[in-house]
């Protein structure tokens, strides 16, 4: 979690002098409670916005907006603490709006916004706005919280952000998988404009089951510059295993910007349609049989072969 470095955040508005400060997430009013405290924020809304850094990079940000309740407690409102908690890491980042003048009226509803918390693709957050000073130990809470889900890099607007582009979001491999005779699959995909290697993981499953019955890894060496954006064709040889008919092909690139953590793309070939009256299968027959002398079905050299070429 971090704050956008540009432009400098502003909380001042007509009728209110205010400055934005970094916060330890532990306001002084927790330690030294006050007698009179303001009411809680109203209509807290969190939206996904996008902002450029000074370097021109585009990042997703949490746009936080809330209003004040129209009661007399604004006379005791000294500011607000904004907190963003990344749920999976338990990392928290806070800023404080420090009011440098008193709010005296409700001629119009007071509205506040902040759009400087940078968020990560495909992550979940809890956003809290605390009005300051915070309440006395048994006082009514004067904060409001909302959860916020950031879309992943498949999302159209997210795709062009710097963190997504760094993980390879602009690469569209347009994978096609074709079943050939003799237990083979032809996988075709578009190479990206970088001289980096790729890995194809073939995982096969029995019909209607989620436990794999065959896995095969295939390495594709880095293409030459003249092969960038060309189609690469790979033929994978399947093991002839009973009922092992649903195949998932996953392509993992190793771009320099994301290394082992690049976005992966996959395509699936379904099992062929079953005939209406299938031959009865004895109860005891396994869904697949390992080759004689082999006790498991994980990939090793004799169980799947492949070859590839780049098509210009």
């Amino acid at each position: 979690l971090r704050l956008l470095d540009f432009p400098a955040p502003v909380c001042a508005q007509e009728g209110l002098s205010c400055r934005v400060k970094n916060s330890t997430c532990l306001d002084d009013s927790w330690i030294h409670p006050r007698n009179l405290t303001p009411s809680s924020p109203k209509d807290l809304q969190i939206q996904l916005h996008f902002a450029h850094t000074q370097q021109g990079d585009l990042f997703p940000v949490a746009h936080i907006e809330w209003t004040l309740q129209t009661d007399a407690s604004i006379l005791y409102l000294e500011g607000a603490e904004l907190s963003v908690l990344q749920l999976n890491t338990n990392e928290r980042l806070c800023v404080r709006f420090e009011f440098l003048s008193k709010l005296r009226h409700h001629h119009r509803r007071w509205r506040f916004t902040f759009s400087h918390f940078v968020v990560d693709p495909d992550q979940e957050y809890e956003v809290t706005v605390h009005h300051l000073p915070k309440p006395i130990p048994d006082g009514d809470p004067n904060h409001q919280s909302k959860n916020f889900l950031v879309p992943d890099c498949e999302h159209a607007r997210m795709k062009v952000t710097t963190p997504c582009m760094s993980s390879g979001s602009l690469w569209d491999p347009n994978i096609t998988v074709e079943t050939l005779e003799a237990h083979q699959l032809r996988v075709s995909f578009t190479l990206w404009n970088e001289s980096t290697h790729y890995q194809i993981l073939l995982t096969s499953f029995p019909h209607m089951e989620n436990h794999s019955c065959f896995e095969h890894m295939h390495h594709i060496p880095a293409p030459r510059p003249e092969e960038f954006h060309q189609r690469s064709n790979v033929t994978l040889t399947l093991r002839n295993l009973k009922g092992c008919c649903r195949h998932q092909v996953q392509i993992q690139p190793f771009f320099s910007s994301c290394l082992n953590d690049c976005l992966r793309h996959s395509a699936t070939v379904s099992c062929p349609e079953m005939p209406d009256t299938p031959e009865p299968i004895p109860d005891y027959m396994p869904l697949w049989e390992p080759r004689s002398g082999s006790s498991d079905y994980k990939d090793d050299d004799d169980k799947g072969s492949s070859h590839h070429h780049h098509h210009h």
Epitope: Q45, I46, L87, N88, T89, N90, E124, S145, K146, N147, F148, L149, P151, D261
Partner: antibody, heavy 116, light 107 residues
Framework: QVQLVQSGAEVKKPGASVKVSCKAS????????ISWVRQAPGQGLEWMGW????????NYAQKLQGRVTMTTDTSTSTAYMELRSLRSDDTAVYYC?????????WGQGTLVTVSS | EIVMTQSPATLSVSPGERVTLSCRAS??????LAWFQQKPGQAPRPLIY???TRAAGIPARFSGSGSGTDFTLTISSLQSEDFAVYYC?????????FGGGTKVEIK
């Protein structure tokens, strides 16, 4: 491909404890939290809580507080949910699911039967 | 706690029909709402998140709409495999809560 595989069905006596496991594969385990949801026979879905696979941070449903403990073992990419002082109304299918807010992948479920 | 109410509890429809399921929150949940489909003996399957975004691999006949307190899941042309129970779930605030479900059955 993302998969969550849960441990098998359990039959327990009232007052006993049960520990259900959920083994994750096909993604970086520490990048997402694991949530637990249960479903009593013929009933709807009930959120039990979640655990961060990264930090171990937890958030439990109020009604289960004190009876439930969620843990993870990052070395085996496995999440665990332990429920103590079992009662007959804890009889349910217990599901693990990936993420903390929106559950995009689910385990197959573990039936826990509490009966004397 | 935010209470999610689904209606109707049961819906009897014929294949090919357009189906509209309703979910109402006891207070605003913005667009922080998901829909799940569950068939007997199976885990729930995610259909929609953020009120209107289809989950990966979900056919275009499923669509979600609404924000605030009122939400709708629409199946434009019901297929035989769509007969199931549908649940909505809010993730706007803790505790996360589900609706009671709507069972879509064959007429």
């Amino acid at each position: 491909q993302v998969q969550l595989v849960q441990s098998g069905a359990e039959v327990k006596k009232p007052g006993a404890s049960v520990k259900v496991s959920c083994k994750a594969s096909g993604y970086t385990f520490t990048r997402y939290g694991i949530s637990w949801v249960r479903q009593a026979p013929g009933q709807g879905l009930e959120w039990m809580g979640w655990i961060s696979a990264y930090s171990g941070n937890t958030n439990y449903a109020q009604k289960l507080q004190g009876r439930v403990t969620m843990t993870t073992d990052t070395s085996t990419s496995t999440a665990y949910m332990e429920l103590r002082s079992l009662r007959s109304d804890d009889t349910a299918v217990y599901y693990c699911a990936r993420r903390q807010l929106y559950f995009d992948y689910w385990g197959q479920g573990t039936l826990v039967t509490v009966s004397s | 706690e935010i209470v999610m109410t689904q209606s109707p509890a049961t819906l009897s429809v014929s294949p090919g029909e357009r189906v509209t399921l309703s979910c109402r929150a006891s207070q605003s949940v913005s667009s922080n709402l998901a829909w799940f489909q569950q068939k007997p003996g199976q885990a729930p399957r995610p259909l929609i998140y953020d009120a209107s975004t289809r989950a990966a691999g979900i056919p275009a006949r499923f669509s979600g709409s609404g924000s605030g307190t009122d939400f709708t899941l629409t199946i434009s042309s019901l297929q035989s495999e769509d007969f199931a129970v549908y649940y909505c779930q809010q993730y706007d605030n803790w505790p996360l809560t589900f609706g009671g479900g709507t069972k879509v059955e064959i007429k």
